[in-house]
C-alpha cells in the first residue's frame, strides 16, 4: 500500500536499520526509498523540546509486515518509503536549506558569487554531494561568500547543525544537470588499481555498473567475470574512486571488465533496474518466501510484486511436477544485492523491477522496429505526438515530442501567428491522422512556454514547451523520450531517425501515415559551409545525405530527430528548418537539444 | 525597420536591357525567399520570378522565362532582377516581395513585405 | 499552370456592410494561399496567409477561409479605408499565379 503523506508527532517503534542526517523530513523519505531495505523512517525536527543532537536525524526502518508501532512523540515526522508506489520517483533535491550547516568532509573551499553559484559547483564536481555556502551577512569576514564542497561515505551528511547566515543544500547530479562527462564505455580485460569503497556480487558488468552508478561513493568499478581465475573473487564488483576521480592505474588481465558510474548519464539510461534473466545463475540471500510459479517471468512479477524482495532464483519444474509450476525465491540483502552467485545449478535468477520506477520511464525499451519503408508501425515512435490546430478549422500544425507526464516539447515557430493555447489540441499514440476523428481524446495545452530569446526559427532558440491540461498515462502507444544527457555533448550518433506527417517533397500534403526516416547527423562546421548566410550555432544540430533525398519537410516542424544510443533513444533534435527539403548539400536544421536541458528543465520542475 | 527599396527603372527601347535592384534592410535577408511581382498600368498583379534564400533555386513565369534572371547578392543584402530583350507588354511597375519559406511547419505564409516598386516603360 | 479566378469583378457596397470576395483555382492548392490588398496608388499588403490566418497588424474584420480550390475573403463591416482592390494568390506550384482581382467600391 502506498502512503505518501507525512505522519506528524509520530514516531515508529524499533526495525531500526540505521540513522542518517537529512535537513527535512521529505528528504529523509528520499533517502528511505532509495536505500535497499528501508520501508519506513522516523525524522526528528529541530525543537526546543528535544535534545539538539538528535535534531535532523533520520532514522531508517525496516519491517516484516512493513508495518511498526506508532508512538506520540513531539518534533518527529514519520512516513513510508515510495518503494510501495506505484509513481514515478527521484533524488533529485534543488531545495536550499537556511540557516542549516550539513556537515561532511569538506575538501574544497572557494569564493562564490551566490549559493546557486556553489550548488553549480558542488553539481559539476566529480566528488561532491552536498555544500555549505556562507552568505555575505555572515559574521565571520574572511569566511563571507566561501562555497565549501563535501563528501560524505553515504552521500547524507553526518551531522546537521543550526548555523546562521548560511545555506546548504545537494549537488543536483541526480537532477541531469552535470556537467561532468559520461563515460558510457565497459572496458574489457582490464582492471582499474584504486582503493576500493566498496564490493558487491554481481552477474554482469553491466549491473556491476549500475550498482556504482547508484553508490554514492563509486566513481568507477572493475568486474571480475564468472571465468576470472581466482574463484571467490568470481562475479565480485569492486567499487572504486580515487582523488583525481579517475582511475590512476589501468591493468591489463583477462576477465576482468572495468567502467565508469553513469552518474552524469543517468536520466537518459536506466540505472536502477536490472530487467535482464540470468540463465544457470543462482543468487543467493537471505530467504523471504518460496512460491509456486509457471515461469521465470512470472517469478520476476511475484518479486516486483513483494515490496521487500530484492531479486530472485527460479528453478523450473521437473517434468510435469507441481502442475508444471517451479521453485520461485524470493530473497534480499542488506545492500540488495545477491551474497553469492552460483554458476551451473540450473537456476534462472534476476532481480525486483521495482526499482525500475526510480529510472526515467523514457528508458524503457520500446518493441522492435521494422527497418526499411518509410511508413512507421504503432508504437514504433511512442514519445511522438501530433499537435492541431482548431481554428479556423481543425489541421496537423506541428509534431512533439513527450519528455514527461505533462510535456510536450517542439518548435517554438509552430506558434506564429496563435494568439491562445485553447486552439491547440495534442493527439498521442497516433499513427494515421486519419484515426483522428471528432470524439478522438486529446490533451488540452494549458501552457505555451516560447523561449524568450526567440526570434525567428532560422537563428536559433526555435524551442518550445507545451504543458498538458491533464497527465498523459504511459502506455505502449504513448510514453516519453529521454532528453540527452548533459554529459553526452561529445557522443556521436549514428542511429538518428527523423519522424512526421510532413510533405514528402516541398509543395505536397500532410501524410495520413506517420513517416520515418533515417538521417545520418553533419558537423557544424559541414552545415555552415551549406548555409553560408546564415550562422549555425552550437545550439542547432544538422542532419542530412550529402545527395539529398531523405529529410524532414513541411509538416515535420516541432517533431523529434531521434537517436538510439546504448539501446535508449533520446530527442537529440527539434526539427526547425531548412531550405527546400532533401535538396542536395542542404541539411535540415535542428534545434539542438543538449544545449537547452537545463531550460527544458528549469521550466518543467518550477514550482 | 524592415524595408525594401527597389531601384534600377525608366524608359528603354524594345529589345534593350534593363537591371533592377532591391536593397533590404532591417531583416536577415539571407533567410528568406525574394520575389519580383510587377503591375502592367491599369492591370492586376503578375508574378514575374522567385529566387531561394540561398540564391541556388529560380522559377520564372513562362511570359518571361529565358529573357529575365533573378540572382541575389546575401552579403549586400540585394535583389537583383537582368531584363534582357524587352518588350512593350513589360512596361509596369516592378515590386520585390519576400517570402518566408525556410521552416518546416505547414503553413504558407504569403508575400509579407513590399518594396513601393520601381516603374519600367519599354518604348520606341 | 494553375488559374485564379476571382468573382465578382466588382463589388458595390456601403461602409458597414459586409463583404464576400470569392476565388477559385483550376486544381487543389491545399492552403497554400495568400490575400492582398492593394489601395489606389500604393503596394499591395498582406492580409490574409496560409488561406485563413490574420497577418499581422490586420483587423480582425477580414477573416479568410476555404481550402482546395474554393476560397473566400471575409470582410464583416466595412470601413472607408477598405475600400480597394483585392487580390488571392497561390503558390502550390512553383509557378506563383495571381488572381484577376475584385475591385470593391462604395455604393
Known amino acids: 500500500e502506498c502512503v505518501t503523506q507525512l505522519l506528524k508527532d509520530t514516531c515508529f517503534e524499533g526495525g531500526d536499520i540505521t540513522t542518517v542526517f537529512t535537513p527535512s523530513a521529505k528528504y529523509c523519505q528520499v533517502v528511505c526509498t532509495y536505500h535497499p531495505r528501508c520501508l519506513l523512517f522516523t525524522f526528528t525536527a529541530e525543537s526546543p523540546s528535544e535534545d539538539p543532537t538528535r535534531w535532523f536525524t533520520c532514522v531508517l526502518k525496516d519491517s516484516v509486515t512493513e508495518t511498526l508501532p506508532r508512538v506520540n512523540r513531539t518534533a518527529a515526522i514519520s512516513g513510508y518509503s515510495f518503494k510501495q508506489c506505484s509513481h514515478q520517483i527521484s533524488a533529485c533535491n534543488k531545495d536550499i536549506y537556511v540557516d542549516l550547516d550539513m556537515k561532511g568532509i569538506n575538501y574544497n573551499s572557494s569564493v562564490a558569487k551566490s549559493a546557486q553559484e556553489c550548488q553549480e559547483r558542488c553539481t559539476d564536481d566529480v566528488h561532491c554531494h552536498f555544500f555549505t555556502y556562507a552568505t555575505r551577512q555572515f559574521p565571520s569576514l574572511e569566511h563571507r561568500n566561501i562555497c565549501l564542497l563535501k563528501h560524505t561515505q553515504t552521500g547524507t551528511p553526518t551531522r546537521i547543525t543550526k548555523l546562521d547566515k548560511v545555506v546548504s543544500g545537494f549537488s543536483l547530479k541526480s537532477c541531469a544537470l552535470s556537467n561532468l562527462a559520461c563515460i558510457r564505455d565497459i572496458f574489457p580485460n582490464t582492471v582499474f588499481a584504486d582503493s576500493n569503497i566498496d564490493s558487491v556480487m554481481a552477474p554482469d558488468a553491466f549491473v556491476c555498473g549500475r550498482i556504482c552508478t547508484h553508490h554514492p561513493g563509486c566513481l568507477f568499478f572493475t568486474f571480475f567475470s564468472q571465468e576470472w581465475p581466482k574463484e571467490s573473487q568470481r562475479n565480485l564488483c569492486l567499487l572504486k574512486t580515487s582523488e583525481s576521480g579517475l582511475p590512476s592505474t589501468r591493468i591489463k588481465k583477462s576477465k576482468a571488465l572495468s567502467g565508469f558510474s553513469l552518474q552524469s548519464c543517468r536520466h537518459s539510461i536506466p540505472v536502477f533496474c536490472h530487467s535482464s534473466f540470468y540463465h544457470d545463475t543462482d543468487f543467493l540471500g537471505e530467504e523471504l518466501d518460496i512460491v509456486a510459479a509457471k515461469s521465470h517471468e512470472a517469478c520476476q512479477k511475484l518479486c516486483t510484486n513483494a515490496v521487500r524482495c530484492q531479486f530472485f532464483t527460479y528453478t523450473p519444474a521437473q517434468a510435469s511436477c507441481n502442475e508444471g509450476k517451479g521453485k520461485c525465491y524470493l530473497k534480499l540483502s542488506s545492500n540488495g544485492s545477491p551474497t553469492k552467485i552460483l554458476h551451473g545449478r540450473g537456476g534462472i535468477s534476476g532481480y525486483t523491477l521495482r526499482l525500475c520506477k526510480m529510472d526515467n520511464e523514457c528508458t524503457t525499451k520500446i518493441k522492435p522496429r521494422i527497418v526499411g519503408g518509410t511508413a512507421s508501425v504503432r508504437g514504433e515512435w511512442p514519445w511522438q505526438v501530433t499537435l492541431h490546430t482548431t481554428s479556423p478549422t481543425q489541421r496537423h500544425l506541428c509534431g512533439g515530442s513527450i519528455i514527461g507526464n505533462q510535456w510536450i516539447l517542439t518548435a517554438a515557430h509552430c506558434f506564429y501567428g496563435v494568439e491562445s493555447p485553447k486552439i491547440l489540441r495534442v493527439y498521442s499514440g497516433i499513427l494515421n491522422q486519419s484515426e483522428i476523428k471528432e470524439d478522438t481524446s486529446f490533451f488540452g495545452v494549458q501552457e505555451i512556454i516560447i523561449h524568450d530569446q526567440y526570434k525567428m526559427a532560422e537563428s536559433g532558440y526555435d524551442i518550445a514547451l507545451l504543458k498538458l491540461e491533464t497527465t498523459v498515462n504511459y502506455t505502449d502507444s504513448q510514453r516519453p523520450i529521454c532528453l540527452p544527457s548533459k554529459g553526452d555533448r561529445n557522443v556521436i550518433y549514428t542511429d538518428c531517425w527523423v519522424t512526421g506527417w510532413g510533405y514528402r517533397k516541398l509543395r505536397d500534403k500532410i501524410q495520413n501515415t506517420l513517416q520515418k526516416a533515417k538521417i545520418p547527423l553533419v558537423t557544424n562546421e559541414e552545415c555552415q559551409k551549406r548555409y553560408r548566410g546564415h550562422k549555425i550555432t552550437h545550439k542547432m544540430i544538422c542532419a542530412g545525405y550529402r545527395e539529398g533525398g531523405k529529410d524532414a519537410c513541411k509538416g515535420d516542424s516541432g517533431g523529434p530527430l531521434s537517436c538510439k544510443h546504448n539501446e535508449v533513444w533520446h530527442l537529440v533534435g527539434i526539427t526547425s528548418w531548412g531550405e527546400g527539403c532533401a535538396q542536395r548539400e542542404r541539411p535540415g536544421v535542428y534545434t539542438n537539444v543538449v544545449e537547452y536541458v537545463d531550460w527544458i528543465l528549469e521550466k518543467t520542475q518550477a514550482v | 525597420e524592415v524595408q525594401l527599396l527597389e531601384s534600377g527603372g525608366g524608359l528603354v527601347q524594345p529589345g534593350g536591357s534593363l537591371r533592377l535592384s532591391c536593397a533590404a534592410s532591417?531583416?536577415?535577408?539571407?533567410?528568406?525567399?525574394m520575389g519580383w511581382v510587377r503591375q502592367a498600368p491599369g492591370k492586376g498583379l503578375e508574378w514575374v520570378s522567385s529566387i531561394s534564400p540561398s540564391g541556388g533555386d529560380t522559377d520564372y513565369a513562362d511570359s518571361v522565362k529565358g529573357r529575365f534572371t533573378i540572382s541575389r547578392d546575401n552579403s549586400k543584402n540585394t535583389l537583383y532582377l537582368q531584363m534582357n530583350s524587352l518588350r512593350a507588354e513589360d512596361t509596369a511597375v516592378y515590386y520585390c516581395?519576400?517570402?518566408?519559406?525556410?521552416?518546416?511547419?505547414?503553413?504558407?505564409?504569403?508575400?509579407?513585405?513590399w518594396g513601393q516598386g520601381t516603374t519600367v516603360t519599354v518604348s520606341s | 499552370d494553375i488559374q485564379m479566378t476571382q468573382s465578382p469583378a466588382t463589388l458595390s457596397l456601403s461602409p458597414g456592410e459586409r463583404a464576400t470576395l470569392s476565388c477559385r483555382a483550376s486544381q487543389s492548392v491545399s492552403s497554400y494561399l495568400a490575400w492582398y490588398q492593394q489601395r489606389l496608388g500604393q503596394s499591395p499588403r498582406l492580409l490574409i496567409y496560409?488561406?485563413?490566418s490574420r497577418a499581422t497588424g490586420i483587423p480582425a474584420r477580414f477573416s479568410g477561409s476555404g481550402s482546395g480550390t474554393d476560397f473566400t475573403l471575409t470582410i464583416s463591416s466595412l470601413q472607408p479605408e477598405d475600400f480597394a482592390t483585392y487580390y488571392c494568390?497561390?503558390?502550390?506550384?512553383?509557378?506563383?499565379?495571381f488572381g484577376q482581382g475584385t475591385r470593391l467600391e462604395i455604393k
Open positions: 494568390q497561390q503558390s502550390y506550384s512553383n509557378l506563383v499565379t
Open positions: 532591417g531583416f536577415t535577408f539571407s533567410t528568406y525567399s
Open positions: 516581395a519576400r517570402e518566408r519559406t525556410m521552416v518546416r511547419d505547414p503553413r504558407y505564409y504569403g508575400m509579407d513585405v
Open positions: 496560409d488561406a485563413s
